[in-house]
Interface confidence: medium
């Protein structure tokens, strides 16, 4: 029997800026029961408070709701484990929700194949931000990836939308049934999960286009470049 | 307003002893982490050891370790260094800093550091 | 341990200039757990300690002008002076505080010409 192993706090994520919710992991239980506490301060006070709510997040997990969760101010946490041989604390975790944000993904997306008359066919996709989000205040600038596929293919293509919560594609395989997704990620924070794929079918006589892949700049409304997923994690905006 | 003074550097022989001190104030000292930080003569900034608010967490530079020890005296707002085995290579100015947080992240204040001189 | 690499080791800048100071990890030292990097970058001029301008790469320290800014993730950071001023004159080190040891970059010289 053995005082317990050091915890560790692996994971901080906020849906909006509004609420959050840490996950630690326990260590070696020391072959007894052992207690766990998770006590933050915020930067600038000493002042220690416990944990406000253990249940929400599930196992050995803390929730900060609206009331406990300030922009702007970094939450300095530890978890500490506690059996009857003794104690151990996690290290410190330091945590500004501005930079925590997962959002869930984006809502409502539409898929259609646009054959003007005039030009050339394309792919219209249309979305809207989650429901958490509120963009309005201007607390938020989300970023959005777009990804497709012809359904029996093995290979993501991926598009930079930027801000928009529209996009066009002009080279697509004519008679293929093709999935599409769309995911958002706040400027600071990290990529939400990709939306459920909604199916379109490509006509037969859609005509293909290698050369132009995306639609011009001018009927985007903006400069296109294709970013890295990599690149794209690491793109702050200061 | 934050103020860090070290005392105790000075001229000492190798293999012999000395120990460095930092008065803080101006700040909650027991609510942050200490370090020291050494700078030898025209060269870069090199850490040294850093102690966290509970006294207990201590971390060194291998080339000290074992031979430095660093702790703090909260109620009199005070860090020390005690230097043992010294060598020609620790020939240096000694900075005491204060970190920014209650762990070792990032030092937002320093003192004007003492000079430590290894020679026979 | 995680070696920091500064460059250029010196320059020379017109007052006035935007200047860019760069600095390379060896391993990550961005968090998955809160999604920062641990570093910092300092300014020390001649005959006095250093001064912390910058941490988790990109905050700036309260009283630090705006002149200054951090950017970058993971393995590449970069300082940026958007207009140097004589007064920017020092030398300026990057430092990790993902792991201990902690350890600096061995510092880039800045001058005007």
């Known amino acids: 029997q053995l005082p317990p192993g050091k915890p560790e706090i692996f994971k901080c994520r906020s849906p909006n800026k509004e609420t959050f919710t840490c996950w630690w992991r326990p260590g070696t239980d020391g072959g007894l029961p052992t207690n766990y506490s998770l006590t933050y301060h915020r930067e600038g006070e000493t002042l220690m408070h416990e944990c406000p709510d253990y249940i929400t997040g599930g196992p050995n997990s803390c929730h900060f709701g609206k009331q406990y969760t300030s922009m702007w101010r970094t939450y300095v946490m530890m978890v500490n484990a506690t059996n009857q041989m003794g104690s151990s604390f996690s290290d410190e975790l330091y945590v500004d929700v501005t930079y925590i944000v997962q959002p869930d993904p984006p809502l409502e997306l539409t898929v259609e194949v646009k054959q003007p008359e005039d030009r050339k066919p394309y792919l219209w996709m249309k979305w809207s931000p989650p429901t958490l989000i509120d963009l309005k205040t201007g607390w938020f600038t989300l970023l959005y990836e777009i990804r497709l596929k012809p359904e029996k293919a093995a290979e993501w293509e991926t598009h930079f939308a930027g801000q928009q919560t529209e996009f066009k594609i002009l080279s697509l395989h004519p008679g293929q049934k093709y999935l599409v997704q769309v995911r958002c990620k706040p400027d600071h924070g990290y990529w939400s999960a990709w939306s459920p794929a909604t199916f379109i079918q490509i006509p037969s006589d859609f005509i293909m286009n290698d050369e132009q892949k995306l639609i011009s700049e001018e009927d985007l409304g903006g400069e296109q470049k294709l970013i890295s997923e990599e690149d794209l994690h690491h793109h702050h905006h200061h | 307003e934050v103020q860090l003074l070290e005392s105790g550097g000075g001229l000492v022989q190798p293999g012999g002893t000395l120990r460095l001190s930092c008065a803080a104030s101006?700040?909650?000292?027991?609510?942050?982490?200490m370090s020291w930080v050494r700078q030898a003569p025209g060269k870069g900034l090199e850490w040294v050891s850093s102690?966290?608010?509970?006294?207990?967490?201590?971390y060194y530079a291998d080339s000290v370790k074992g031979r430095f020890t660093i702790s703090r005296d909260n109620s009199k707002n005070t860090l020390f260094l005690l230097m043992n085995s010294l060598r020609a290579e620790d020939t240096a100015a000694y900075y005491c800093?204060?970190?920014?947080?209650?762990?070792?992240?990032?030092?937002?204040?320093w003192g004007q550091g003492t000079l430590v001189t290894v020679s026979s | 341990d995680i070696v920091m690499t500064q460059s250029p080791d010196s320059l020379t800048v017109s007052l006035g200039a935007r200047t860019t100071i760069n600095c390379q990890s060896s391993?990550?030292?961005?968090?998955?757990?809160?999604?920062?990097?641990?570093l910092a970058w300092y300014q020390q001029k001649p005959g006095l300690p250093p001064k912390l301008l910058i941490y988790?790469?990109?905050t700036r320290e309260s009283g630090v002008p705006d002149r200054f800014s951090g950017s970058g993730s993971g393995t590449d950071f970069t300082l940026t002076i958007s207009s140097l001023q004589a007064e920017d004159v020092a030398i300026y080190y990057c430092?990790?505080?993902?792991?201990?040891?902690?350890?600096f970059g061995q510092g880039t010289k800045l001058e005007i010409n």
């Open positions: 800093a204060k970190a920014r947080y209650s762990s070792n992240w990032g030092f937002d204040f």
């Open positions: 101006g700040f909650t000292f027991s609510a942050y982490a």
């Open positions: 988790w790469s990109s």
């Open positions: 391993q990550t030292i961005l968090h998955s757990s809160n999604n920062h990097n641990y």
């Open positions: 102690i966290n608010v509970r006294a207990g967490d201590t």
């Open positions: 430092q990790q505080y993902s792991n201990t040891p902690y350890t």
